[in-house]
Interface confidence: low
Amino acid sequence: SSSPTSSASSFSSSAPFLASAVSAQPPLPDQCPALCECSEAARTVKCVNRNLTEVPTDLPAYVRNLFLTGNQLAVLPAGAFARRPPLAELAALNLSGSRLDEVRAGAFEHLPSLRQLDLSHNPLADLSPFAFSGSNASVSAPSPLVELILNHIVPPEDERQNRSFEGMVVAALLAGRALQGLRRLELASNHFLYLPRDVLAQLPSLRHLDLSNNSLVSLTYVSFRNLTHLESLHLEDNALKVLHNGTLAELQGLPHIRVFLDNNPWVCDCHMADMVTWLKETEVVQGKDRLTCAYPEKMRNRVLLELNSADLDCDPILPPSLQTS
């Protein structure tokens, strides 16, 4: 993922501050919280691997880059970063590996310049639909977020709520249409079996989408048509068997796209013919010469680019009377 950005957005929040939501004592300008390291020159505060159980209340108002990694935060409540005066310059917030399992509605409210948020490597069993929008209105105030890093946020299976993890994450991404300005979204290593069909259409500003190391079997119902700004699409290390004509045409129609498809179990039968033809012609697939067949057994490790139509056959389906056990 990207390094923290140093440019603060000019977006400002009009939400009123509630006394209960902000720390009572305004911090001294040069104060540094206990267990943290601060650099006013670099506008950076690092509270790393300190087993913190809550966000420090006395963060300096100058902070632009905040690292709260490797802690034991468990829950991020509403207004977790609300302060008086507000942390008006905070642009990059890294909370990775901090044992967060619950992020509540409005957790990131009152951060008017927050452009980059990293929640990776937290077992998020309960991610509120309004974690990023801060409001249950059908259309929320736009979030200033430009980069959202959510790699490996899937909790162990025995700690998940009894619902679709994919659905929970997508609900948070789409709530209130708050993330219309999002340019980078990383969702790698989350065991996703599918991508809900409406998610990409509602994130029209995306430049970079990372879905690598999931369990995606098919993209048949996923539309990339609206993602005219998309520059990179990472689909490595999934369970993709073939890309069908509709998907191929949509990808080919994106003007700036680079697609990464390594390490998928491609099935090289008659259904693969269109994809092989497309691969031979397209420039959008990076490392296309590395793509190899996984199935059927007779085709294993064959390079897709070296196949021709005669190689790509489907065994005839025998009528029931001719099938043997």
Epitope: G70, G97, S98, H121, P123, E157, L193, S215
Partner: nanobody, 120 residues
Amino acid sequence: EVQLVESGGGLVQPGGSLRLSCAASGFTFSSYAMSWYRQAPGKERELVASITTAGGSTRYADSVKGRFTISRDNAKNTLYLQMNSLRAEDTAVYYCNAELGPRRLGMDYWGQGTLVTVSS
């Protein structure tokens, strides 16, 4: 082929210590969270401890908090469980687990287990 091989079990007196190891191969060890489970005779398998990819986040069953420590060495592809102040109720077969994908697709892997017996 994914392989998880536990070692370090044995007979120990109450109050004693053991260190279990799990050598992993066949997958990118550093990319996956890892766990230790245990199963006592006649009981269901239970989660003992888990650790995230870089080791920045750990969690423990209430019954072992403060006594057991899970850790990993990504350079050696090895998972560890340091067990101190052992009690008779810790007697069980301990299993190393790698959840490489959804369990409902059979994408979690288990070692063969190592027996820990706490007895005087």
